[in-house]
């Protein structure tokens, strides 16, 4: 039985050319996190592994920075970065927990952070 919940930054928006931090947090479980994957649709952005630390996919190396914590920082944003992002927590013994974040990259300067929400 998986008792944990993933809290994410939810629906967020940011300005073109700027940067944004994607954050997830796993709570309500004593499971041990063994790895966190960050994915954009079906593309792997980065991995944070308990043994090996961070690995950033080569195609994103220039624009993706690890952290803070288990989060991911996206830099030099373009309109093409708009879309769904997923944090995938691999845990023992529970298995996999997934959180979803929707990022909208705006041309104007009216970008505003959305509210937090939870995914069981």
């Amino acid at each position: 039985m998986m008792t944990g919940t993933i809290e994410t930054t939810g629906n967020i928006s940011a300005e073109k050319g700027g940067s944004i931090i994607l954050q997830c947090h796993l709570s309500s479980t004593t499971a041990q996190v063994t790895q966190v994957n960050w994915e954009q649709q079906d593309q792997l952005l980065a991995i944070c592994n308990a043994d090996l630390g961070w690995h950033i996919s080569p195609s994103f190396k220039d624009r993706v920075a690890p952290g803070p914590g288990l989060g991911l920082t996206l830099q030099s944003l373009t309109v093409n970065d708009t879309g769904e992002y997923f944090c995938i927590y691999h845990t023992y013994p529970d298995g996999t927990y997934t959180g979803r974040i929707f990022l909208e990259v705006l041309e104007s300067s009216v970008a505003e952070h959305g509210a937090r929400f939870q995914i069981p």
Partner: antibody, heavy 121, light 108 residues
């Protein structure tokens, strides 16, 4: 070969302090979550504290009887976990075991041979 | 705190007999977080069963584990001389982690 070697035990007066160390080898220490478990003479096992991996923000958790008095820490560069014990009481007298647990597709659970802490005046 | 109560406290049996050790939790434990340890005099405990039913490396197939919720069991189908020891159940489903008081399996 996996080894966990505890050290730092001994005789200490009530109210005193002691720092235990546990040196690990033979497995990927940075990926292991580490615990201290104790066993009073002739008694059962009691969980004392844990420290998680970097991916788990090196989170620490404690048993009720030691909370606020004991502090667990780790140094991944030295593959060592520590237990700083303050305000020691007679009821803290026990063999203290270091335990390491690791999951990399298979679950592993390793224990040291223990170090004896005696709190007495 | 989840209190684990093991029964019986002592179990006296002969080699070849079947042994059933019970562990009852004061509130529900997720099955992945219920472990059994074996301890012999003067030795550190050894992981015996994890995740309720998975045998640790090197543990003979005569051992099995089962249960869910608040009731868990370790069974030895036919006792061998080396099985006589103290067995502890352990949960890390919620803080603080706890152990049962142990069942001593002794030769009759």
């Amino acid at each position: 070969e996996v080894q966990l070697v505890e050290s730092g035990g001994g005789l200490v007066q009530p109210g005193g302090s002691l720092k235990l160390s546990c040196a690990a080898s033979g497995f990927t220490f940075s990926g292991a979550w580490m615990d201290w478990v104790r066993q009073a003479p002739g008694k059962g096992l009691e969980w004392v504290a844990e420290i998680r991996t970097k991916v788990n923000n090196h989170a620490t958790n404690y048993g009720e009887s030691v909370k606020g008095r004991f502090t667990i820490s780790r140094d991944d560069s030295k593959s060592t976990v520590y237990l700083q014990m303050n305000s020691l009481r007679a009821e803290d007298t026990a063999v203290y075991y270091c335990r390491g647990a690791l999951y990399d597709g298979f679950y592993f659970d390793y224990w040291g041979q223990g170090t004896l802490v005696t709190v007495s005046s | 705190e989840i209190v684990l109560t093991q029964s019986p406290a002592t179990l006296s049996l002969s080699p070849g007999e079947r042994a059933t050790l019970s562990c009852s939790a004061s509130s529900s434990v997720s099955s992945g977080y219920l472990y059994w340890y074996q301890q012999k005099p003067g030795q550190a405990p050894k992981l015996w069963i994890y995740g309720t039913s998975t045998l640790a490396s090197g543990v003979p197939a005569r051992f099995s584990g089962s249960g869910s919720g608040t009731d868990y069991t370790l069974t030895i189908s036919s006792l061998e001389p080396e099985d006589f020891a103290v067995y502890y159940c352990h949960q890390w489903s919620s803080f603080p982690y706890t152990f049962g008081q142990g069942t001593k399996l002794e030769i009759k």
